[in-house]
Amino acid sequence: LVPHLGDREKRDSVCPQGKYIHPQNNSICCTKCHKGTYLYNDCPGPGQDTDCRECESGSFTASENHLRHCLSCSKCRKEMGQVEISSCTVDRDTVCGCRKNQYRHYWSENLFQCFNCSLCLNGTVHLSCQEKQNTVCTCHAGFFLRENECVSCSNCKKSLECTKLCLPQIENVKGTEDSGTT
C-alpha cells in the first residue's frame, strides 16, 4: 500500500528538489526560501525570484521552506529545571538542557524535567549518569537499592523486595526479637 501524501507534499513532489509548486499556478515552480527566512510572496513567474524575508527576533526556520510565518522560538521550562544551552537564532531553535550532574527525565516526547544524578552513597557507581539516564548504583553489603539510593537493611521490612538482599540482617532482627521472649 502506498501511503497517502498530504496536499502540500503532493504539490511539492511535482517540482524538483528545492522548489515548490505555485499555489495559484501549478505550472510554476518557485524556489524555496533558505533557512532563517520565510515566504513573503510567491515567485511571479518561472525563473523569477521568490520573495523571502528574514525571520524576526524571537522566531526561526531551521530548514528550507515555503512557510508564510517563521516558527516561534521555544522557551526553556524553568519550572522543570531546564537551562538554556544555546539561544534561538533565525535558523535554529533554542536548545534547552540540564545543569552539570543532572539528567533528563522525559514526561512526553518534547517535555523533560531535570533531576540530580544519584551519588551512590553507601554503594558504587555501576553505570555513570548519562544525558537521559540516572546513575546506576550497586549497593555495599548491608544496604539495598530503593529509588536508586542505597538504604540501610535496618529499614527493610519483611513485606518488601529487599528481604532477599537483606536476608542475613532480617534473620538477625528476627532472632533478636525471638530471644526477647522467655
Epitope: H105, W107, S108, Q113, F115, E147, N148
Partner: nanobody
Framework: EVQLLESGGGLVQPGGSLRLSCAAS????????MGWVRQAPGKGLEWVSF????????YYADSVKGRFTISRDNSKNTLYLQMNSLRAEDTAVYYC?????????????WGQGTLVTVSS
C-alpha cells in the same frame, strides 16, 4: 477500553485537606506515567503534578509545591493526589490523565474529573 475514574473531590475550607483518587482500567497501568491536571472556572488547563511509572520521578507545579503529594499504587491501578493547606485558588475540576494523552481534549480521553471547591 481505557477508563479513568476520579473521586475524592468536595467542598473544603481554606487550610483543609483532601485526597483525590483515580481508578484506572483498560490499560497496563504500571507501564505508564500519570498526571493530575486541573481546570479552574473560566480558565485553561494547568498541569498540577506528574509521576513516572514506578514512582521514582515526580513533578509539581510551583503553585502546589510543598502542599500537594502525588503517589500511585500499581497493585491497585490507582493514582492519588494528597492536597494539604488548600487555598481558594485551588478550586477547580481535577482530572487524571495518562501522560501520552496530555495534549488530547480532556473530555474525550480523560475521566469526568472531580470538583474541588475551597471556600469558607
Amino acid at each position: 477500553e481505557v477508563q479513568l475514574l476520579e473521586s475524592g473531590g468536595g467542598l473544603v475550607q481554606p487550610g483543609g485537606s483532601l485526597r483525590l483518587s483515580c481508578a484506572a482500567s483498560g490499560f497496563t497501568f504500571d507501564k505508564y506515567q500519570m498526571g493530575w491536571v486541573r481546570q479552574a472556572p473560566g480558565k485553561g488547563l494547568e498541569w498540577v503534578s506528574f509521576i513516572d511509572s514506578n514512582g521514582h520521578h515526580t513533578y509539581y507545579a510551583d503553585s502546589v509545591k510543598g502542599r500537594f503529594t502525588i503517589s500511585r499504587d500499581n497493585s491497585k491501578n490507582t493514582l492519588y493526589l494528597q492536597m494539604n493547606s488548600l487555598r481558594a485558588e485551588d478550586t477547580a475540576v481535577y482530572y487524571c490523565a495518562e501522560l501520552d494523552n496530555l495534549s488530547i481534549t480532556p473530555f474525550d480521553y480523560w475521566g469526568q474529573g472531580t470538583l474541588v471547591t475551597v471556600s469558607s
